[in-house]
Interface confidence: low
C-alpha cells in the first residue's frame, strides 16, 4: 500500500526545489541577547505573530529583567521591534501572552511592577498588536486574564488575594465580584463558575468548598453545590467532585443544565490520594479516568452515556502517574472515533493501545510493514507498535515531540515509536499512519521534530540533534519520499519549529540561536513552500477513501458509531496546493443498527465476549445508590442506551421488557436548604 520511506533516493526529486525554496527563505536575526523566546499567533490566518524575548539577570536582592516584543504580519518572514509600544516594560513570562479567542485580535501582556505598587499593570491591544494601551490594575493578578469564549470583551482574573475580578470592557475597568475564590472558569453564555472557601483557605477547605455560578457577570449569584473538592467543564457537561457524608471519599456529580440539577455519576468513589480526570469530552460524551487506590500510576478509563451519568468501563490499567501528572491519552483528530493511550502491564512495561470506536474496544497498534521486533519482544515475528507520548517526554527519553494529527489532514498520524512488546528506552524512530492508525510505516530514522503544512500536502521534519543543524526535510507524498534542503550556510542550535495552528499554512519557521564566544543571537528562518506546490489542486488530484475500512466485502465496512464516511483525499502523487480555504470533503452514510451501537444502561453489564446486556446480579432486589437530578424517582430502562454520537438507523433494535428500577437518592449534594440565590449589592 505504501513503500518504505526514502530520503533523496529512489524518489523523484522535485524539479528546481532548491532554487524555489532559496527564493522563499527569509532570515530574521533578533538584535538582543535574551535567554528565552515565546511565540504566539494572533488570530486565524492573519499572518500576525508576536514574539516576546526575555532576559533576566538575577541580582542578590532583586532580579533585573528586560523584554523585547517583536511583531510579524507575514507569517514570520519579517519582524518589527515594537517594544516601544509597551514602553520598554518587562513582561512577566509566567503569564504568557493572553491571546483573545477566535479572530478578536485581542492581546494582553502582563507587566512586572515594583514591590510597593497598588496593583498590577497590563498592556492591551485589540487590533492584532498594532497598538497597545497601558492599564494599571486595582489588584495583583494571580492568573492570566481569561477571555469569555462568547465575548472577548469580558475578562476574568483571580488576584493574589483570592478575589475574583471581572472586566466588561476588555480590561479597561475592573470590578471585584467575589472574595475568597479558589478556582474560576468561564462556562457557556458568559456564565462564570467558581469555588469559594467558607472558613480558612482554599487548601484547608478542600472538600468543603462551595460551587457558585453567576450568569450576569457578578450582579447575582447562585450556590449550586456544597462540600466541593473541585469542578471541571467538558463538552456540555459540568462536573463536580463532592465529599461523601460518612467518610473522606468523594464522588463525581454531573449537570447538563449549568448546575441547576445534578445527578450522581455511576463511577467509583475515590479516596484522598486518588483523583478523577476528564481525558476528553465533546458534546456527546466524556472519557473519564478514575485513579486506582495506592500509588500505582494507573487507573481505569470509563466512557459516559449521553447524559454523562452512566459509565462503561473502557480500559483497565490506564497509565496516568499522579494528579496533574502524565498520561499518554491522545485524541487522533484526523479520524473520528480514534484515540491512542498507554497501559501499564503487570510487569511494569508500558504498552500502547488504540481505539477506533470512541473507547468501545481497545487493541494494540498493528506492527508496521517490513519492520523487525526489537529486544522487548518475546516472539521476534509477532509484536506491535508502541507510541511515545507525554509520559516518555517526561521521562527524558529521546522523544522531542508528542504524536501529531490535524483534523484537515485526514487520516494522517505521526508519532515516535518502537516496535516490540512494549515501549523501549532505545532511541525511537518516527512512524506515520495515513489511515487514522490502522496501519503504520516507518517515516524517518531516529527522533525528529515534525509538522504538517497545507492540510497534509507537505510534511516537514528536522532531525533532533544536540549539534547545530542547517537542514530541513520535507515530503509531498505523506512521508514516503523525502527531500533535504539546506536553509542556511551557518548552522544554528535548533529550538523549535513554528507553523500557524491549523496546518493550513505553507510557511514553516525554524527557530534557534547562533552562539559565538561571547554572544548568543536568536534567529528565525521562515521557509515558504508555495512555489514547491506551484498549482492549486484540482478534482483529479483527489481520490475517494472510505474511512475505517477493514473488510471491503462487508456491507458494514467502515461503519463506526452508526455511520460511515467517504472522504476525498489528495493523491500521494499529486504535488499541488490544497490551499488555505481547503475544506475536507466527506460523504457520510448511515449504517443499520446492531448491538454494537448500544451501551448497557444503568444496572446492566456485558459479560466478557458477549454482546447482550444482562442485569447486574448484585443489584437485583436492592435499592440502588443512584441519584438522578437529585430527586427520588423511578428509573425505567430496557437495559440498552444508544452510544453517544451514534447515528445508526433501522437494523436491530434491542427491544425487551422495560424494567422499573426503584432507587433511592443517596446524594444530599443539592440539599435545597443549601441552594441560595444571592444578589451582589
Amino acid at each position: 500500500r505504501r513503500g518504505a520511506p526514502a530520503e533523496d533516493q529512489d524518489c523523484g526529486r522535485l524539479p528546481d526545489f532548491i532554487a524555489k525554496l532559496t527564493n522563499n527563505t527569509h532570515q530574521h536575526v533578533f538584535d538582543d541577547l535574551s535567554g528565552s523566546v515565546s511565540l504566539s499567533w494572533v488570530g486565524d490566518s492573519t499572518g500576525v505573530i508576536l514574539v516576546l524575548t526575555t532576559f533576566q539577570v538575577p541580582l542578590v536582592i532583586v532580579s533585573f529583567g528586560q523584554s523585547k516584543l517583536y511583531r510579524s504580519e507575514d507569517y514570520g518572514k519579517n519582524f518589527k521591534d515594537i517594544t516601544n509600544l509597551i514602553n520598554n516594560t518587562f513582561i512577566r513570562t509566567e503569564f504568557g501572552m493572553a491571546i483573545g479567542p477566535e479572530n478578536s485580535g485581542k492581546v494582553i501582556l502582563t507587566a512586572e511592577v515594583s514591590g510597593g505598587s497598588r496593583g498590577g499593570r497590563v498592556f492591551r491591544s485589540s487590533d492584532f498588536a498594532k497598538n497597545f494601551v497601558q492599564t494599571d490594575l486595582p489588584f495583583h493578578p494571580l492568573t492570566q486574564m481569561m477571555y469569555s469564549p462568547q465575548n472577548s470583551d469580558y475578562l476574568l482574573a483571580l488576584s493574589t488575594e483570592n478575589g475574583l475580578w471581572v472586566s466588561k470592557n476588555f480590561g479597561e475597568k475592573w470590578e471585584e465580584i467575589h472574595k475568597a475564590v479558589c478556582l474560576a472558569k468561564w462556562g457557556p453564555n458568559n456564565i462564570i463558575f467558581f469555588t469559594t472557601h467558607v472558613n480558612g483557605s482554599c487548601k484547608a477547605d478542600l472538600g468543603a468548598l462551595e460551587l457558585w455560578r453567576t450568569s450576569d457577570l457578578g450582579k447575582t449569584f447562585k450556590t449550586i453545590g456544597v462540600k466541593i473538592y473541585s469542578f471541571g467543564l467538558g463538552g456540555r457537561f459540568l462536573f463536580a467532585s463532592v465529599m461523601a457524608d460518612k467518610d473522606t471519599t468523594r464522588r463525581i456529580h454531573v449537570s447538563t443544565d449549568q448546575g441547576d440539577t445534578w445527578s450522581m455519576a455511576q463511577l467509583p468513589s475515590v479516596g484522598q490520594e486518588q483523583f478523577y480526570s476528564i481525558l476528553a469530552a465533546n458534546e456527546d460524551m466524556v472519557f473519564m479516568h478514575v485513579d486506582e487506590p495506592g500509588d500505582t500510576g494507573f487507573g481505569t478509563i470509563f466512557t459516559s452515556d449521553d447524559r454523562g451519568i452512566v459509565y462503561s468501563k473502557s480500559l483497565d490499567r490506564h497509565l496516568y502517574t499522579t494528579t496533574g501528572g502524565e498520561t499518554d491519552f491522545t485524541n487522533v483528530t484526523s479520524l473520528r472515533g480514534v484515540y491512542i493511550t498507554s497501559t501499564l502491564s503487570e510487569d511494569n512495561s508500558i504498552q500502547s493501545m488504540i481505539t477506533f470506536d470512541q473507547g468501545g474496544r481497545w487493541e494494540h497498534l498493528r506492527k508496521p510493514e517490513n519492520s523487525k521486533c526489537d529486544a522487548t519482544a518475546k516472539n521476534k515475528n509477532e509484536c506491535s507498535l508502541h507510541i511515545h507520548a507525554s509520559y516518555s517526554i517526561s521521562q527524558k527519553l529521546n522523544v522531542p515531540m508528542a504524536p501529531l494529527s490535524e483534523p484537515n489532514a485526514v487520516g494522517i498520524v505521526i508519532a515516535h515509536g518502537s516496535v516490540g512488546d512494549a515501549i523501549s528506552v532505545m532511541v525511537p524512530d518516527v512512524y506515520i499512519s495515513d489511515d487514522g492508525g490502522y496501519s503504520w510505516a516507518k517515516m524517518l530514522e531516529g527522533p525528529h521534530y515534525y509538522t504538517i503544512l497545507d492540510s497534509g500536502g507537505i510534511i516537514v521534519a528536522i532531525e533532533h540533534s544536540n549539534r547545530p543543524i542547517n537542514v530541513i526535510k520535507f515530503s509531498t507524498d505523506e512521508g514516503q519520499c523525502w527531500q533535504s534542503y539546506v536553509f542556511t550556510q551557518e548552522p544554528i542550535y535548533f529550538t523549535g519549529l513554528a507553523s500557524e495552528p491549523g496546518a493550513r499554512s505553507m510557511n514553516i519557521s525554524i527557530w534557534g540561536f547562533t552562539e559565538s564566544f561571547i554572544t548568543r543571537q536568536w534567529v528565525s528562518y521562515t521557509v515558504d513552500f508555495k512555489d514547491i506546490l506551484e498549482r492549486n489542486c484540482e478534482e483529479d488530484d483527489y481520490t475517494t477513501w472510505l474511512a475505517h475500512s477493514t473488510d471491503p466485502g462487508d456491507y458494514k465496512d467502515g461503519c463506526i458509531l452508526g455511520y460511515k464516511e467517504q472522504f476525498l483525499r489528495l493523491r500521494k502523487s499529486s504535488v499541488c496546493q490544497n490551499g488555505r480555504d481547503y475544506v475536507v470533503a466527506k460523504q457520510p452514510s448511515v449504517c443499520p443498527c446492531s448491538l454494537e451501537d448500544f451501551l448497557c444502561d444503568f444496572g446492566y453489564f456485558r459479560p466478557e465476549n458477549a454482546s447482550e446486556c444482562v442485569e447486574q446480579p448484585e443489584l437485583k432486589g436492592h435499592e440502588l445508590e443512584f441519584c438522578l437530578y437529585g430527586k427520588e424517582e423511578h428509573l425505567t430502562t430496557n437495559g440498552y442506551r444508544k452510544i453517544p454520537g451514534d447515528k445508526c438507523q433501522g437494523g436491530m433494535n434491542p427491544a425487551r421488557e422495560v424494567k422499573d428500577l426503584k432507587k433511592k437518592c443517596t446524594s444530599n449534594f443539592l440539599n435545597p436548604t443549601k441552594q441560595n440565590s444571592k444578589s451582589n449589592s
Epitope: 486565524d44 490566518s45 492573519t46 499572518g47 507575514d74 519579517n78 518589527k80 479572530n103 480555504d581
Partner: antibody, heavy 129, light 107 residues
Framework: QVQLVQSGAEVKKPGASVKVSCKAS????????MSWVRQAPGQGLEWMGI????????SYAQKFQGRVTMTRDTSTSTVYMELSSLRSEDTAVYYC??????????????????????WGQGTTVTVSS | EIVMTQSPATLSVSPGERATLSCRAS??????LAWYQQKPGQAPRLLIY???TRATGIPARFSGSGSGTEFTLTISSLQSEDFAVYYC?????????FGGGTKVEIK
C-alpha cells in the same frame, strides 16, 4: 506624522510610459505594503497591484499584468509605479496607499484586513494625442 | 475575481437622519472588507476595516457590520461633512476589488 507624497501631474502621448513616485515618511517604510489604486474621471476606484517594500516582491491585477511595474528604493523610502503602452483610457488619478495586510494580495488573504490606512494625494495622468 | 456590488448607487438623506449603505460580494470574503469615504478632489479615507472595526479618528456614528457576502455601513446621524461617495473593498482574494460606490447626497 505618517504621510505619502506623490509626484506631480503628467501629460503623456498614447504608447508612451509614465512613472509615478510615492515618498513615505513618518513610519518604518519596509514594515508596510504599498498598493496602487487608480480612478478614471467620474469613475470608481480600481486596484492595480501591490509591492512589499521590504523584499521588493510584487503582485499585479491581471488587467495590468505586463504593462505595470512597481519598484521601491529603500534608501529614499520611495515606491514607484510605471505604466507602459499608455492608452487614452489610462487617463486617471493614480494613488499610492499604505496597505498593512498586503501579504495575501497574490492569493487567499488573511482572515483579517486592516484596510488601506494612509493615501497619497494622487497624481493626475492624462493620456492624449 | 470577486465582484463587489454596492446599493443604492445614490442615497438622498436629510442631515441628522440615518443612512444605510449595502455592499454585496460575489463570493464569501469573510471579514476581509474595508469601507472608504471620498469627497470631490480628495483621496479616499479609510473608515472601517475588518468589516466592523472603526479606523483611527473615525467618529462613532460610523459603524460596519456583516460577514461573508453581505455587508452594511451605517451612519447613525448624518452630518454635513458626511455627504460624499462611499466605497467598499474586499481583500479576501487578489486582486483587491472595490464596489462601484454609493453617493450620499443631501435631500
Amino acid at each position: 506624522q505618517v504621510q505619502l507624497v506623490q509626484s506631480g501631474a503628467e501629460v503623456k502621448k498614447p504608447g508612451a510610459s509614465v512613472k509615478v513616485s510615492c515618498k513615505a515618511s513618518g513610519y518604518t517604510f519596509t514594515s508596510y505594503y504599498m498598493s496602487w489604486v487608480r480612478q478614471a474621471p467620474g469613475q470608481g476606484l480600481e486596484w492595480m497591484g501591490i509591492i512589499n517594500p521590504s523584499g521588493g516582491s510584487t503582485s499585479y491585477a491581471q488587467k495590468f499584468q505586463g504593462r505595470v511595474t512597481m519598484t521601491r528604493d529603500t534608501s529614499t523610502s520611495t515606491v514607484y509605479m510605471e505604466l507602459s503602452s499608455l492608452r487614452s483610457e489610462d487617463t486617471a488619478v493614480y494613488y499610492c496607499a499604505r496597505d498593512p495586510s498586503g501579504i495575501a494580495a497574490a492569493g487567499p488573504a488573511s482572515r483579517y484586513y486592516y484596510g488601506m490606512d494612509v493615501w497619497g494625494q494622487g497624481t493626475t495622468v492624462t493620456v492624449s494625442s | 475575481e470577486i465582484v463587489m456590488t454596492q446599493s443604492p448607487a445614490t442615497l438622498s438623506v436629510s442631515p441628522g437622519e440615518r443612512a444605510t449603505l449595502s455592499c454585496r460580494a460575489s463570493q464569501s470574503v469573510s471579514s476581509n472588507l474595508a469601507w472608504y469615504q471620498q469627497k470631490p478632489g480628495q483621496a479616499p479615507r479609510l473608515l472601517i476595516y475588518g468589516a466592523s472595526t472603526r479606523a483611527t479618528g473615525i467618529p462613532a456614528r460610523f459603524s460596519g457590520s456583516g460577514s461573508g457576502t453581505e455587508f452594511t455601513l451605517t451612519i447613525s446621524s448624518l452630518q454635513s461633512e458626511d455627504f460624499a461617495v462611499y466605497y467598499c473593498q474586499q481583500a479576501r482574494l487578489g486582486p483587491w476589488t472595490f464596489g462601484g460606490g454609493t453617493k450620499v447626497e443631501i435631500k
